[in-house]
Interface confidence: medium
C-alpha cells in the first residue's frame, strides 16, 4: 500500500482491536450518478452468451440481495440464432466485498467478507487439448 | 427486509450514531475456498469480445487496487479472427462496495461507498433503430 500521513482528527483506536475493527459509516456514498444502468440492463438477453439472473438473498449479509448470473447455454448463439457448441458460454466472476453480521443477528456489528459472484457471461473459444 | 431477533450478545450502539456507524472486523473471511478451478481461464483474451485490464488505484479506498475491464473493439471477433462490426462488444458492469477512508488518511474510520466497475465484456446484437 501507500504511506499516508495520519489525520490528527481521526477517531481513537484501541490497540487491542486495531487495525482489525474499524468504524464504518453505512450512509452509502454512490459514485455512479452519471452512469445509465438502463443501457446495460438487457445485455443478458442480447448477448451471444445470454444469461439468467438469480436472486441470492441473505438477511445476515449487507447487501442482503445479490443477483447472480447463470449462463443459459453451454455454447454460444450464432448468427442464425442457434446454439453453436464449437464455442463456450462462460460466467465472468468477480470477488466482491460484503458485510456479514457478526455475531449473527447484530444490527451494528459486522465482519468484512469476500464472496465470488457471477456478473454475466461471455463467449470464448474453447481450450482444445490435443492427445499425443 | 426481514426482521431478525436481536442477539443479546451484540455490542452496544449509541442511539445518536445508530444505525449509521457500525463496527466492522477487517479480518476478511473468504467464502470462495471451494471455488478454485485448477486452471486460470484467461477469458479476457479468449472471448469474442476481448478486453484489456486496467489498474485503478486509490490509497484512500479499500481495496486500494481494482482491476477494470475495457473492451478492445467496438465489434466482436468472428470465426475468422476478424472484427465484425455487425455485433457490439459491451462492458458488463457491476456495482461493488468499497470502504473509503473518512475523514481522509484515517486508518480506522471508513464510509461505505458504491462504485461501478466493468468486470469483462460480452458480445451483443446491436439495437437497430429503424427510421420511419
Amino acid at each position: 500500500g501507500i504511506t499516508i500521513p495520519r489525520n490528527p482528527g481521526c477517531p481513537n483506536s484501541e490497540d487491542k482491536n486495531f487495525p482489525r475493527t474499524v468504524m464504518v459509516n453505512l450512509n452509502i456514498h454512490n459514485r455512479n450518478t452519471n452512469t445509465n444502468p438502463k443501457r446495460s440492463s438487457d445485455y443478458y438477453n442480447r448477448s451471444t452468451s445470454p444469461w439468467n439472473l438469480h436472486r441470492n438473498e441473505d438477511p445476515e449479509r449487507y447487501p442482503s440481495v445479490i443477483w447472480e448470473a447463470k449462463c443459459r447455454h453451454l455454447g454460444c448463439i450464432n448468427a442464425d440464432g442457434n446454439v453453436d457448441y464449437h464455442m463456450n458460454s462462460v460466467p465472468i466472476q468477480q470477488e466482491i466485498l460484503v458485510l456479514r453480521r457478526e455475531p449473527p443477528h447484530c444490527p451494528n456489528s459486522f465482519r468484512l467478507e469476500k464472496i465470488l459472484v457471477s456478473v454475466g457471461c461471455t463467449c470464448v473459444t474453447p481450450i482444445v487439448h490435443h492427445v499425443a | 427486509g426481514i426482521t431478525i431477533p436481536r442477539n443479546p450478545g451484540c455490542p452496544n450502539s449509541e442511539d445518536k450514531n445508530f444505525p449509521r456507524t457500525v463496527m466492522v472486523n477487517l479480518n476478511i473471511h473468504n467464502r470462495n475456498t471451494n471455488t478454485n478451478p485448477k486452471r486460470s481461464s484467461d477469458y479476457y483474451n479468449r472471448s469474442t469480445s476481448p478486453w484489456n485490464l486496467h489498474r485503478n488505484e486509490d490509497p484512500e479506498r479499500y481495496p486500494s487496487v481494482i482491476w477494470e475491464a475495457k473492451c478492445r473493439h467496438l465489434g466482436c471477433i468472428n470465426a475468422d479472427g476478424n472484427v465484425d462490426y455487425h455485433m457490439n462488444s459491451v462492458p458488463i458492469q457491476q456495482e461493488i462496495l468499497v470502504l473509503r477512508r473518512e475523514p481522509p488518511h484515517c486508518p480506522n474510520s471508513f464510509r461505505l461507498e458504491k462504485i461501478l466497475v466493468s468486470v469483462g465484456c460480452t458480445c451483443v446484437t446491436p439495437i437497430v433503430h429503424h427510421v420511419a
Epitope: - | 476478511i28 486460470s40 481461464s41 484467461d42 479476457y44 486496467h54 489498474r55 487496487v65 482491476w67
Partner: antibody, heavy 120, light 110 residues
Framework: QVQLVQSGAEVKKPGASVKVSCKAS????????MNWVRQAPGQGLEWMGD????????IFNQNFRGRVTMTRDTSISTAYMELSRLRSDDTAVYYC?????????????WGQGTLVTVSS | DIVMTQSPDSLAVSLGERATINCKAS??????????MHWYQQKPGQPPKLLIY???NLEAGVPDRFSGSGSGTDFTLTISSLQAEDVAVYYC????????FGGGTKLEIK
Amino acid sequence: QVQLVQSGAEVKKPGASVKVSCKASGFTFTDYYMNWVRQAPGQGLEWMGDINPKNGGTIFNQNFRGRVTMTRDTSISTAYMELSRLRSDDTAVYYCARSILTGPFYFDYWGQGTLVTVSS
Amino acid sequence: DIVMTQSPDSLAVSLGERATINCKASQSVSFAGTGLMHWYQQKPGQPPKLLIYRASNLEAGVPDRFSGSGSGTDFTLTISSLQAEDVAVYYCQQTMEYPTFGGGTKLEIK
C-alpha cells in the same frame, strides 16, 4: 530488441541519496509501467513502486515511507529512481522492470541491476 | 498487502525428474477468470527472468518443460524433466494488488 540499461554501481554514506537511471529501447516507452524492484544480498525480491511514463503517475510500496521518488524523461526514454536518507539495510541490487499498462502487470523485461552499497 | 508463501524453501531433484514448486496467496489473486500470478527464474548474478505469466501462460522462448497451473489462492510451477541449466531460485509474484513476491525456492540437482 527490448533493452533496459541501468546506471553503474554506487557507494553511498548513510543519510545520503542515490539516483539510479534506467534507459529503455526497442519498445514504446509510454506503453509500459516502469517498476523498481530491489534485492538485498542473499534475499528475495521487493517491489518498490512504479511510474506510468504516459502521465508521470507513481505508486509506492509503503515500506519506503516517502523516501523514494520516481521520475521519467520521455524524450530520452529513461526512468529514474531516487532513494533518500539511505541506511545500511538499503544495500541491495536495484532493478528496473517493465509491465504493460493494459495489465495484468507481469514484468517481462528487466534491467541488469545496479548495486548500491551504503557504508560509512 | 497480499502475502505470498512459497514452498518448499529449497528442493533437490535428480536430472530428468519432475520438480514442483507451490505458491499460496493470503487471498485470491484471480480476477474475472484470470490468475494474476506469475513465475520468475533467477540465476546467480542475473536479473529475474519471466517464465510463466497469468498462472499458466508460457513466456516466449521458455522451454515447454516449464508449466504453471492454479487459480484463486493456490498455484504451482512444474518442471517436467529437470535439466542442469534449471538450477536457480524461483519466485512467484502476484499483481492482483500492489505486487508482492514469494520468498523464493532454491532448486538444486540431487
